[in-house]
């Protein structure tokens, strides 16, 4: 039975041209971690893989890092970075777990974090 | 349990636009994205798009933008796929399929059976 | 478009034989690798995903693996039920793409 939750940063908000870190983290369950992959809707970002190590996608090269952790770190935000985004934990023996942030790219110096919220 | 369920056969002249349905049932039909895949006679997996039925967004594969438009009805949680200008390269079976997981990849975990469409004059 | 190509078409095995299929993409997926098994008239089922996690439900008899751009799909023992028509899919970007399927055959 899957027994764990992923707490993320939920709705945030940063200025356009600056960065943010898009987190998620697993608890309640001791299931091992083996892959966490970030993702839009219909693009993948970055996979963390526990034995290949970071990829990440070559549409984001320049404007993606990993980390920290197994979070990551998009840089020289515009307009269209504003969406969804998904990190998906792969996890032995549970199988995946899903969470959803919700960033929001604004024009002006107004951007501020949204609340933490957990998904079951 | 989930289950998506398709429309039935369909027969079409060339020119002719055909619509198909997919009623999903066991889930949340707003939390989970419903793609559409083809498969013509004794031929491979074509992929013709996605849509996020929560918010209506879409997504479609180059090859079948301008002719495919998939919609979906929060109401009776029943997503479409209408195909217009049909051609006999169109006969195909038509799935709709669900991803696993709540926000997940695009890997499909749930098909519809299949809806036979032939196009012939 | 990512191309996928499986290898071979088609194959011909007895039960309790070892199958493998291949499957290379046209550029790194990284592990973005889905497997299906089809039977005639049926709609695909999904066995792996992520190159090398096991479905649920899925008998522990099919295991993926592979990254970057070479993937395999092993069958270790094959049973009866097992004699279908296999596809890979990346799920590394849109569009989806699917391999032109291995038919596993009895010899």
């Known amino acids: 039975m899957m027994t764990g939750t992923i707490e993320t940063t939920g709705n945030i908000s940063a200025e356009k041209g600056g960065s943010i870190i898009l987190q998620c983290h697993l608890s309640s369950t001791t299931a091992q971690v083996t892959q966490v992959n970030w993702e839009q809707q219909d693009q993948l970002l970055a996979i963390c893989n526990a034995d290949l190590g970071w990829h990440i996608s070559p549409s984001f090269k320049d404007r993606v890092a990993p980390g920290p952790g197994l979070g990551l770190t998009l840089q020289s935000l515009t307009v269209n970075d504003t969406g969804e985004y998904f990190c998906i934990y792969h996890t032995y023996p549970d199988g995946t777990y899903t969470g959803r942030i919700f960033l929001e790219v604004l024009e002006s110096s107004v951007a501020e974090h949204g609340a933490r919220f957990q998904i079951p | 349990q989930v289950q998506l369920v398709q429309s039935g056969a369909e027969v079409k002249k060339p020119g002719a636009s055909v619509k198909v349905s997919c009623k999903a049932s066991g889930y949340a039909f707003t939390n989970y994205l419903i793609e559409w895949v083809r498969q013509a006679p004794g031929q491979g997996l074509e992929w013709i798009g996605v849509?996020?039925?929560?918010?209506?967004?879409?997504n479609y594969n180059e090859k079948f933008k301008g002719r495919a438009t998939i919609t979906a009805d929060k109401s009776t949680s029943t997503a479409y796929m209408e195909l217009s200008s049909l051609r006999s390269e169109d006969t195909a079976v038509y799935f709709c399929?669900?991803?696993?997981?709540?926000?997940?990849?695009?890997?499909?975990?749930?098909w519809g059976q299949g809806t036979t469409v032939t196009v012939s004059s | 478009d990512i191309q996928m190509t499986q290898s071979p078409s088609s194959l011909s095995a007895s039960v309790g034989d070892r199958v493998t299929i291949t499957c290379r993409a046209s550029?790194?997926?990284?592990?973005?690798v889905a497997w299906y098994q089809q039977k005639p008239g049926k709609a695909p089922k999904l066995l792996i995903y992520s190159a090398s996690f096991l479905y649920s439900g899925v008998p522990s008899r099919f295991s993926g693996s592979g990254s970057g751009t070479d993937f395999t799909l092993t069958i270790s023992s094959l049973q009866p039920e097992d004699f279908a028509t296999y596809y890979c899919?990346?799920?590394?970007?849109?569009?989806?793409?699917f391999g032109q399927g291995t038919k596993v055959e009895i010899k």
């Open positions: 399929a669900r991803r696993g997981d709540k926000y997940g990849s695009a890997w499909f975990a749930y």
């Open positions: 550029q790194d997926v990284s592990t973005a």
């Open positions: 849509i996020n039925p929560g918010s209506g967004g879409t």
């Open positions: 899919q990346q799920h590394y970007s849109s569009p989806r793409t």
